[in-house]
Interface confidence: low
């Protein structure tokens, strides 16, 4: 025997108080497929959450964060406070990346400049707070008697790790 | 981000009628919108929502006479029948089921007049 | 549909006192409550949503409470810029009971 409350369509819910009747979902609530026996409550887009698609009858809301934090977590489940570039966020509040480390972005953490080094080749531009170093060919590179010009690298623009 | 609503203009009774809003800087697949309309020195009267699917939802007393539909920018009000009953400033608003209705446009009148 | 009645119609006070306004649904319309002002010729102003909740930019002087069918606005430290209409508004309709404003208050600062 065919279940009667397959009949009720997304936006309704097959309503055992009243005969198994498809009811339309109650306020603020919602149901995304057919054959609900109960309508899930809407998300609330509320403080630091800010509403990035409305509820309706069949579809959930969708938060995103107000300026000046980003999401975490699936969905935007959670809002973070944004940091400058050239800063980490801690425990504390937003700190300026140590000498040797750089941020590029106005959330995670600061990472290690790449060391030139370990790739046999030389710092071509110097890291700050906000860019991770540009490094240049290795002395090899040059065959003797060559005049060392500098060459443009590759993905070495502002924003842009070498590696 | 803003509303403008648009099409108010002098009609006799019995004229259809058709005011559009034209929304900037949010989508219409991401908000409510309704129409709201208030005559002359009266309150306010919400006259139908379209939700972010598209669904309609009228009040009582608007079924059948008022139409609401949408493009990727606009939604309009189709009004059939107008009677002198019909004269006032015609408001679309954005909103929901959260906050309300958040954002008006400034209005369009329209005025029924044989 | 909802019908929300609001009340008073009118309200004078002078500057720098308080004024509440209230509204009563005929059902409960769980919180799903807004409050606005509209000045002549204007379009209205959203203050308050979810029936306490202060919209972004709305000076503190706005207060407003309520549960159930009873609810409440009050303007304290009243200013001669707070002379408007204030408009209650139900604002949830998925249910089919359909969105309904209130008939509005006149308040008028001396």
């Known amino acids: 025997l065919q279940d009667p409350c397959s009949n009720c369509p997304a936006g309704t819910f097959c309503d055992n108080n009243r005969n198994q009747i498809c009811s339309p979902c109650p306020p603020n609530s919602f149901s995304s497929a057919g054959g609900q026996r109960t309508c899930d409550i809407c998300r609330q887009c509320k403080g630091v959450f800010r509403t990035r698609k409305e509820c309706s009858s069949t579809s959930n809301a969708e938060c995103d964060c107000t300026p000046g934090f980003h999401c975490l977590g699936a969905g935007c489940s959670m809002c973070e406070q944004d940091c400058k570039q050239g800063q980490e966020l801690t425990k504390k509040g937003c700190k300026d990346c140590c000498f040797g480390t750089f941020n590029d972005q106005k959330r995670g953490i600061c990472r290690p400049w790449t060391n030139c080094s370990l790739d046999g080749k030389s710092v071509l531009v110097n890291g700050t707070k906000e860019r991770d170093v540009v490094c240049g060919p290795s002395p090899t590179d040059f065959s003797p008697g060559t005049p060392s010009t500098t060459m443009p690298v590759p993905g070495g623009e502002p924003g842009h790790t070498s590696h | 981000q803003s509303l403008e609503e648009s099409g108010g203009r002098l009609v006799t009774p019995g004229t259809p009628l058709t005011l559009t809003c034209t929304v900037s800087?949010?989508?219409?697949?991401?908000?409510?919108m309704s129409w709201v309309r208030q005559a002359p020195g009266k309150g306010l009267e919400w006259i139908g929502y379209i939700d972010v699917g598209g669904s309609l939802y009228y009040a009582s007393w608007a079924k059948g006479r008022f139409t609401i539909s949408r493009t990727s920018t606009t939604v309009d009000l189709k009004m059939t029948s107008l009677t002198t009953e019909d004269t006032a400033t015609y408001f679309c608003a954005r909103g929901g089921l959260t906050y309300g209705f958040d954002l008006w446009g400034p209005g369009t009148l329209v005025t029924v007049s044989s | 549909d909802i019908v929300m009645t609001q009340t008073p119609a009118s309200v004078s006070e002078p500057v720098g006192g308080t004024v509440t306004i209230n509204c009563q649904a005929s059902?409960?319309?769980?919180?799903?409550l807004a409050w606005y002002q509209q000045k002549p010729g204007q379009r209205p102003k959203r203050l308050i949503y979810?029936?306490?909740d202060l919209a972004s930019g709305v000076p503190s002087r706005f207060s407003a409470s309520g549960s159930g069918t009873e609810y409440a606005l009050t303007i304290s430290d009243l200013e001669s810029a707070d002379a408007a209409t204030y408009y209650c508004h139900y604002y949830a309709t998925i249910s089919g009971l359909g969105v309904a404003f209130g008939g509005g208050t006149e308040v008028v600062v001396k």
């Open positions: 979810g029936a306490s």
């Open positions: 800087g949010f989508s219409l697949n991401d908000y409510w």
């Open positions: 059902e409960d319309i769980s919180s799903y």
